[in-house]
């Protein structure tokens, strides 16, 4: 629970954060778990502790292991563990999976690739960026602060991106590299003002007293992945969850993607054991996205049982 995985390459700087947090004035002690040996705080050491941070300047394969940090607070000590693995540098270009940070996705509109863990280091701009080991050149690529911006992203931009920067500690410079995968989302889609397919505006739905009834709110929001889209039911202008009638519940239907590629959502309102008072309520099907909100109102009316004597 209080353990975090960290990794790095030999002869590069690696800085690790204690998984436990505290106030800036709390002291933090670090130990090498296997030997229970205290990590020194003197900066002349290659591996030293600096408050919440453990610094390997530079790292060696032999540094791999579990490190314990203890945050000493007035009432109790908080113990955390940093599981550190230092790998040998690869001679070829491939970056193995175990050295990869989390994958990020981008699109034509949003193509920022953040350099992982950089906030831990004392670095100065600009960052160097590489894709599949090739230095990135050209006006489409812009190194900005701690991230890379790619203009006019195309599917070919997917791949492994490595950021390289220099960490400075007391005048000495150490190299750091970090790699993550970048995937490109197909953004042929679009978003439009919600279109409610059902129910019709001011629809009257016939129901039988004592029976169950279902109302379906169905709306479409555009094509492709929608950033924000929702359908929901309201009773007399109140959310179902807040209305407080356990007989009336809403249940998400299937995300629908019709053959024409439209992104649609369903929300089914289930009314158990329909009562007279249910006929007095106003049922609103709401569909909303970034463009706005559309509302269709439904009322219930009593369905007369078929008169078998006529």
């Amino acid at each position: 629970k209080f353990s975090k995985q960290s990794w790095g390459l030999e002869n590069e700087a690696l800085i690790v954060r204690c998984p436990r947090q505290g106030k800036p004035s709390y002291t933090v002690d670090w130990y090498y778990s296997q030997t229970n040996k205290s990590i020194p705080t003197q900066e002349r050491n290659r591996v030293f502790a600096s408050g919440q941070l453990l610094k390997f300047l530079p790292a060696a394969v032999a540094d791999s292991g579990i490190y314990t940090c203890i945050v000493r607070s007035p009432t109790f000590n908080r113990t955390g563990y940093a599981n550190v693995t230092i790998y040998k540098k690869q001679s070829d270009c491939n970056v193995p999976d175990y050295l990869m940070y989390s994958t990020v996705s981008g699109s034509e509109k949003n193509s920022k690739i953040y350099c992982p863990t950089i906030d831990l280091y004392n670095w100065t701009a600009p960052l160097e960026w590489f894709k599949n080991c090739q230095a990135l050149q050209g006006s489409r690529y812009r190194a900005h602060k701690s991230f890379l911006v790619i203009d006019n992203v195309m599917t070919e931009d997917a791949g492994d991106y490595t950021c390289k920067f220099i960490h400075n500690e007391n005048g000495a410079n150490y190299s750091v590299t970090a790699t993550r995968s970048f995937t490109v989302k197909d953004e042929q889609g679009f978003s439009l003002f919600p279109v409610i397919g059902a129910p019709a505006q001011n629809e009257i739905k016939e129901v039988e007293i004592g029976k169950n009834a279902n109302l379906t709110c169905s709306a479409c929001f555009g094509k492709g992945t929608q950033f924000l889209a929702a359908v929901l039911w309201q009773l007399n202008g109140t959310k179902i969850t807040d209305f407080g009638e356990p007989r009336i519940q809403q249940e998400e239907g299937q995300n629908q993607s019709f053959s024409n590629g439209l992104a649609c959502l369903d929300m089914v309102l289930r009314i158990a054991d329909v009562k007279e008072e249910d006929l007095l309520l106003q049922y609103d099907c709401l569909a909303l996205n970034l463009h706005g909100l559309r509302r269709h109102t439904v009322r219930l009316s009593r369905k007369n049982p078929i008169d078998h004597h006529s």
Epitope: R17, K23, S25, Y26, T75
Partner: antibody
Framework: QVQLVQSGAEVKKPGASVKVSCKAS????????MNWVRQAPGQRLEWMGW????????TYGDNFKGRVTITRDTSASTAYMELSSLRSEDTAVYYC?????????WGQGTLVTVSS | DIQMTQSPSSLSASVGDRVTITCKSS????????????LAWYQQKPGKVPKLLIY???TRESGVPSRFSGSGSGTDFTLTISSLQPEDVATYYC?????????FGGGTKVEIK
């Protein structure tokens, strides 16, 4: 500069739940814990709990255990506080405040009104 | 839980006066591990967010005017405004920053005579 921006005012019915968000900017989110503090009208400040933003571990005040849930989304640099089974006494301004020696940075506050 | 008791609950003073607010905690806020007193003072103006004035019982937060000072150790603490200014009209709270649950005093409302 450090900024904590909270979600807007909410009106809730007794028994309902409310979820307040707090978006952090101007610093590295996972470097500092996030506290939640509330203040009922004319009352003293009341600490509700905090979350270790790095590993996501929350700690709750005894008065709120079982009713409050504090979470975070590191990719969005946002902390959340959800309070359930609301009652009229929960009507208050809810603040997020960054952990430190004292709380130097506060959100602007979110007014939650609980009324039938 | 650590109880925080502030006095007075309200006071009225003239511009230029020296104002003293006291705060007592039910348990010591001194941490022997680093000799810090984990007590903070806040200023809150009507309808505004609390503002940190003092932490560690006596360390002034950056940007806070030098007329505000904090003192005390263990269980007894004091916030002093050496020369009250019109903009100091507010409610002042002390806070146990030592252990969970962090608790606040009941507040001292400061007004100008």
């Amino acid at each position: 500069q450090v900024q904590l921006v909270q979600s807007g005012a909410e009106v809730k019915k007794p028994g309902a739940s409310v979820k307040v968000s707090c978006k952090a900017s101007g610093y590295t989110f996972i470097n500092y814990g996030m506290n939640w503090v509330r203040q009922a009208p004319g009352q003293r400040l009341e600490w509700m709990g905090w979350i270790n933003t790095y590993i996501g571990e929350p700690t709750y005040g005894d008065n709120f255990k079982g009713r409050v849930t504090i979470t975070r989304d590191t990719s969005a640099s946002t902390a959340y506080m959800e309070l359930s089974s609301l009652r009229s006494e929960d009507t208050a301004v809810y603040y997020c405040a960054r952990e430190g020696d004292g709380f130097a940075y506060w959100g602007q506050g979110t007014l939650v009104t609980v009324s039938s | 839980d650590i109880q925080m008791t502030q006095s007075p609950s309200s006071l009225s003073a003239s511009v230029g006066d020296r104002v003293t607010i006291t705060c007592k905690s039910s348990q010591s806020l001194l941490y022997s591990g680093n000799q810090n007193n984990y007590l903070a003072w806040y200023q809150q103006k009507p309808g505004k967010v609390p503002k940190l004035l003092i932490y560690g019982a006596s360390t002034r937060e950056s940007g806070v005017p030098s007329r505000f000072s904090g003192s005390g150790s263990g269980t007894d603490f004091t916030l002093t405004i050496s020369s009250l200014q019109p903009e100091d009209v507010a409610t002042y709270y002390c806070q146990n920053d030592h252990s969970y649950p962090y608790t606040f005093g009941g507040g001292t409302k400061v007004e100008i005579k």
